[in-house]
C-alpha cells in the first residue's frame, strides 16, 4: 500500500534570466527511492538513478543542473519555461509517486515563492 506523500515547492515564480530550484520531498513512507525523473509536461528533463547517477537530457544540458539533493536547478530562465514540472519518485516497494510544481517566469523583479503544499 502506498502511504507516502510528496511535498513540493508548490507554485513558484522567478525572474527571467535568473535561476530556480525545483524540489520535491517524499515523506511518510519507508520505501526506498531508486530513481527520480524530472519532466516538464511530457518532456524529460533529467533522471537521477541510485545506481547510475544523474542524466540530463541533451536539450537541457546548458540550462539544467542536478541537485541540490534529488532536486533540479533551472538556469537562465525564459518566459517559455513557465509551466508545470513533475517529479516522479520510483520507489521500492511502493511504486511511483508524482509531485507537481507550477513555475511562472516573470519579466519584473517582484517574483516571489509560493506556499508549499502537499500532493498525496
Amino acid at each position: 500500500m502506498m502511504t507516502g506523500t510528496i511535498e513540493t515547492t508548490g507554485n513558484i515564480s522567478a525572474e527571467k534570466g535568473g535561476s530556480i530550484i525545483l524540489q520535491c520531498h517524499l515523506s511518510s513512507t519507508t520505501a526506498q527511492v531508486t530513481q527520480v525523473n524530472w519532466e516538464q509536461q511530457d518532456q524529460l528533463l533529467a533522471i537521477c538513478n541510485a545506481d547510475l547517477g544523474w542524466h540530463i537530457s541533451p536539450s537541457f544540458k546548458d540550462r539544467v543542473a542536478p541537485g541540490p539533493g534529488l532536486g533540479l536547478t533551472l538556469q537562465s530562465l525564459t518566459v517559455n519555461d513557465t509551466g508545470e514540472y513533475f517529479c516522479i519518485y520510483h520507489t521500492y516497494p511502493d511504486g511511483t509517486y508524482t509531485g507537481r510544481i507550477f513555475l511562472e517566469v516573470l519579466e519584473s523583479s517582484v517574483a516571489e515563492h509560493g506556499a508549499r503544499f502537499q500532493i498525496p
Epitope: 519532466e39 509536461q41 511530457d42 518532456q43 524529460l44 538513478n49 520510483h90 508524482t98
Partner: antibody, heavy 117, light 107 residues
Framework: QVQLQQSDAELVKPGASVKISCKVS????????IHWMIQRPEQGLEWIGY????????KYNEKFKGKATLTADKSSSTAYMQLNSLTSEDSAVYFC??????????WGQGTTLTVSS | DIVMTQSHKFMSTSVGDRVSITCKAS??????VAWYQQKPGQSPKLLIY???YRFTGVPDRFTGSGSGTDFTFTISSVQAEDLAVYYC?????????FGAGTKLELR
C-alpha cells in the same frame, strides 16, 4: 477504476474526415495527457501526438501534422482526434492512452477505421 | 527521431522456458524505456517502465533490464497466456517511438 472508452468502428470514403472519441472515467480528466497511437494492419504502434486537457495544449508527431487534430472537452471528459483527407493508408486501429508519468498505464479498446470507396 | 530496434520479429518458446527479448535504441535513452504486451484484438498492456520497474499487478516472472541503448525484457518461465506480441517504447523524447514488436509463439 480508470477507463478509456473509444467510439465504435468507422467505415468512411476516401477524401472524407472522421472524428474518433475517447471518453475517460475513474480519474480527473485534466490531470493527465491523452495520447493517440495508430496501428496499421499487421504492423507495430506509432505515436500520433497528445493533448493536455487542463490547458488544451497539444504536441504532434511531425508525420501526422495536418492529418490529425486533437481536441478535448472538459465538460464531458472526452478527448477527440479528427483525421482528414482520408486515404486507404489511414485504414488502421487507433488507440487513445492515458500517460500517467512516465508511462501509458491505461489504453482505450481501439477504434477500427476502414477507408474504402 | 529515436529508432527502437527489436532484432527478432518472432521468437519460438515452450511453456516453462526462459525467454529474453532485446531492444536497441538508436541513441542513449538512459532508463526511459517501457515494455508492453499486446494480444490479438486487444490494446497494449503496460508491463515494465523506466527499463526495470514492474507495473502494478504484473507477475514477477516479467523483468526488464538495461540502460543507455541496450534493453532486455525477460520472462523467467513462460506461461501459455504469455503468448503475445511484446513492444519496447522509449519515453525519453518526442516523438515517442516503439519497436516493431516481437511475437512470442509456441515451438
Amino acid at each position: 477504476q480508470v477507463q478509456l472508452q473509444q467510439s465504435d468502428a468507422e467505415l468512411v470514403k476516401p477524401g472524407a474526415s472522421v472524428k474518433i472519441s475517447c471518453k475517460v472515467s475513474g480519474y480527473t480528466f485534466t490531470d493527465h495527457t491523452i495520447h493517440w497511437m495508430i496501428q496499421r494492419p499487421e504492423q507495430g504502434l506509432e505515436w500520433i501526438g497528445y493533448i493536455y486537457p487542463r490547458d488544451g495544449s497539444t504536441k504532434y508527431n511531425e508525420k501526422f501534422k495536418g492529418k490529425a487534430t486533437l481536441t478535448a472537452d472538459k465538460s464531458s471528459s472526452t478527448a477527440y482526434m479528427q483525421l482528414n483527407s482520408l486515404t486507404s493508408e489511414d485504414s488502421a486501429v487507433y488507440f487513445c492512452a492515458r500517460r500517467a508519468l512516465p508511462y501509458f498505464d491505461c489504453w482505450g479498446q481501439g477504434t477500427t477505421l476502414t477507408v474504402s470507396s | 527521431d529515436i529508432v527502437m530496434t527489436q532484432s527478432h520479429k518472432f521468437m519460438s518458446t515452450s511453456v516453462g522456458d526462459r525467454v529474453s527479448i532485446t531492444c536497441k535504441a538508436s541513441q542513449d535513452v538512459f532508463t526511459a524505456v517501457a515494455w508492453y504486451q499486446q494480444k490479438p484484438g486487444q490494446s497494449p498492456k503496460l508491463l515494465i517502465y523506466s527499463a526495470s520497474y514492474r507495473f502494478t499487478g504484473v507477475p514477477d516472472r516479467f523483468t526488464g533490464s538495461g540502460s543507455g541503448t541496450d534493453f532486455t525484457f525477460t520472462i523467467s518461465s513462460v506461461q501459455a497466456e504469455d503468448l503475445a506480441v511484446y513492444y519496447c517504447q522509449q519515453h525519453y523524447s518526442t516523438p515517442l517511438t516503439f519497436g516493431a514488436g516481437t511475437k512470442l509463439e509456441l515451438r
